[in-house]
Structure formats: C-alpha cells, structure tokens
C-alpha cells in the first residue's frame, strides 16, 4: 500500500462559502470517502471554517498506510467582502466597459495571495480592473470573472453589459 | 520584499514642470490603489493624488487639480505623478503609497523623493 | 474639505509613562456604509510614515498591543500604554470616509520628557 502522505499528495480543494454563517466548507476532490482525523468531515467536506484562517487536516484511508497526509487549509476571504462593480463613464458607455472588484470591507488574508481574472470573449486579463475601449455600439458584452486565493477559486460573478447607442452621425 | 522607490525629485523654478516616478516591487502592482501623499517642510503630510489598480479612476484634492496628473504603467510596475505650474507650496518630499483599495490603509510607503520649487 | 484637528502638538513624556493623542474632525467620518475610516500613522525620524491603526481601533499586523485607537463620529483617541524609545516620532491621524477628499490631521510630536 502507498502512504497516505504520498498517495493525497496533489489532492485539490474547492472552497464553499455559507453567506447565512458566514463559514467556508472545503470540499476534498477526492474519489473515496477519507477520514479527517480531529477534523470531522462530513462526505469529503470540512465544515465551519473561517475566512482567513489555516486549519490542518490529516487525510487517512484505509486504502494507504501512515504517515497521514497533512493538508493545510488556506482559508479564502469572505465572499461578501467582493462585489464587481460597473465603472463605466456615462459618457463613454457607447464604446466602453469598465468593470472592477471592489474590496468593500477589510480582511486578515495576505491581498498578495489574491488574483483576480476576467474574461470577456475571447479576452483574458489578470486584474482586479479592466476597461475596454474601442467596442461597437449597442451590441452585448459578456465578462466572467473569478477571484482565486493561493490559486483555489472562492467566488466569481458574471456581468452582460451592453453598450449604448452611438451618438447621431458616428 | 514589498518595495516602492520614488524617483525625479529634483530643484525646479515656479512655474516649471517635473515628472515623478514611483517603482514597484515584491507584489502584485496592478491589483492595487495608488497614491501620492507629500510632506511639507513644515512636516504637514498632505494627499496630493490617487488612482485606481487599473488606472481608470483618478482623483486629485483642488490645491493640485490641473496642474498634477498621477498615471501608471502595470507593465512596468511603476506609477508617475506629473507636476506641471508648480509653485513654491509645492516644496516637499513626496512619498507614493500603496492602498489595497480605497476603504482600506496605507499599508507600504516609499521612502521619498524631494521636490523643491525655487528660484 | 474635512479638517482633522490633533492636540496637542507637543506630548512630553517619560519612558514608561501612558501617552494620549486626540483627533477631531470637522464633520462626522462615519461612512454611509457604516464604516469610520480612521488610521493613525508614525512616522519616525528619517523615516516614511507607518501604519499603526486603522478602522479607528484596528491593529494593523506587527504593532505591538500597547498601541491602541479609540472613539467615534468626530472624536479619537490613540492611546499608547506604556512608551517606549522606539514609540518617539511624529504621529498623524488620517481620514479615508470622505473619498476622495482623504486628509491628514497635523502632527502630534511624542518626544521625551
């Protein structure tokens, strides 16, 4: 049998998060159900983590033997702490669009952990603002962007912008 | 090592113009607010100047606004403050600062470069 | 604009001793979002500014827990518990509610007694 330590060693993590609790859950990608050692976990999950904080968990099955694979995790911030905001000018809004993550509240997590990604189109940009300019009047522009902490997902948002009416004579 | 190193300061005669530079270190440049705060020699620490991670929104207190441009460059890593008609009050030591977003803290700081305005 | 207002300029004191900074504002910095955008900053000699508080009562990381921010609408308070050598320099309140018209209260100078 391999070790646990050796067999979980690239197991990915999906972060959950309870706006009501204002918990995360981490859900373990894995195919077998794991046990968590002091960590309860409930179908692969860790329940009632809070935002910011490390919490270690032992991974074992009975398919691997000791030493346990221990998985720390890197607790995103609070979703509600994001919101995506349109900040496109009145006045450009026939060819532009301006979109951008606003942190509305502080948090504990290192911001340098945080990346952030747009995509609209065909177009992928790694930043927390974007404008783009030069677009046709009047048509619709789709954007999905993702915020990722140590480059685990915790929330995205979509946004459908579409662009004005060109001014009399364009 | 999180770092911002100002750059340009410089002599200048009222009504000359001088460009600031401000290089960015150790950190995701373009996924932080900027600004420009000075302190006269008087030690008062005035906020001369803000932008936005992307560069889209700009905002500059009335002493400066028309005669100052703050920009940046996230390909570069570097943020400018263009200083144009300067003036005597203008004397400083000018310090870019770094500020996560606008309801959040100064939480970095260069250690400064000087501008006087004499002539 | 919003006029931050420190006293005193000048807080003499002995090494060991409580230390007590007040800053008023001109209007309420109470933000419609509910937040009061206060920080306080030192700035030491021959050095940029520092952190200290932020949020009115928030430590930022690394500043020691004798250091502490108090108050509400137009009144605040960094208390400092016991003074020591390295807590000497210039200290400046800052308010962020009114964006983006931030500003700077003055300087309050701690310097031994």
């Known amino acids: 049998k391999p070790t646990c330590d050796e067999k979980y060693a690239n197991i990915t993590v999906d972060y959950l998060y309870n706006k009501e609790t204002k918990l995360f859950t981490a859900k373990l990608n894995v195919n077998e159900k794991v046990e968590c050692g002091n960590n309860t976990c409930t179908n692969n999950e860790v329940h009632n983590l809070t935002e910011c904080k490390n919490a270690s968990v032992s991974i074992s099955h009975n398919s691997c033997t000791a030493p346990d694979k221990t998985l720390i995790l890197d607790v995103p911030p609070g979703v509600e702490k994001f919101q995506l905001h349109d900040c496109t000018q009145v006045e450009k809004a026939d060819t532009t669009i301006c979109l951008k993550w606003k942190n509305i509240e502080t948090f504990t997590c290192d911001t340098q952990n945080i990346t952030y990604r747009f995509q609209c189109g065909n177009m992928i940009f790694d930043n927390k603002e974007i404008k783009l300019e030069n677009l046709e009047p009047e048509h619709e522009y789709k954007c999905d962007s993702e915020i990722l902490y140590n480059n685990h997902k915790f929330t995205n948002a979509s946004k459908i912008i579409k662009t004005d009416f060109g001014s009399p004579g364009e | 090592e999180v770092q911002l190193v100002e750059s340009g300061g410089d002599l200048v005669k009222p009504g000359g113009s001088l460009k600031l530079s401000c290089a960015a270190s150790?950190?995701?440049?373009?996924?932080?607010?900027m600004s420009w705060v000075r302190q006269t020699p008087e030690k008062r620490l005035e906020w001369v100047a803000y932008i936005s991670s992307g560069g889209v929104s700009t905002y500059y207190p009335d002493t400066v606004k028309g005669r100052f441009t703050i920009s940046r460059d996230n390909a570069k890593n570097t943020l400018y403050l263009q200083m144009s008609s300067l003036k005597s009050e203008d004397t400083a030591m000018y310090y870019c600062a770094r500020r996560y977003d606008v309801w959040w803290y100064f939480d970095v700081w260069g250690a400064g470069t000087t501008v006087t305005v004499s002539s | 604009d919003v006029l931050m207002t420190q006293t005193p300029l000048s807080l003499p004191v002995s090494l060991g001793d409580q230390a007590s900074i007040s800053c008023r504002s001109s209007?309420?910095?109470?933000?419609?979002?509910?937040?009061?955008?206060l920080e306080w900053y030192l700035q030491k000699p021959g050095q940029s500014p520092k952190l200290l508080i932020y949020?009115?009562?928030n430590r930022f990381s690394g500043v020691p827990d004798r250091f502490s921010g108090s108050g509400s609408g137009t009144d605040f308070t960094l208390k400092i518990s016991r003074v020591e050598a390295e807590d000497l320099g210039v200290y400046y309140c800052f308010q962020g509610s009114h964006v983006p018209m931030y500003t700077f209260g003055g300087g309050t100078k701690l310097e031994i007694k």
């Open positions: 949020k009115v009562s």
């Open positions: 150790g950190f995701a440049f373009s996924n932080y607010d």
């Open positions: 209007q309420s910095i109470v933000h419609s979002n509910g937040n009061t955008y």
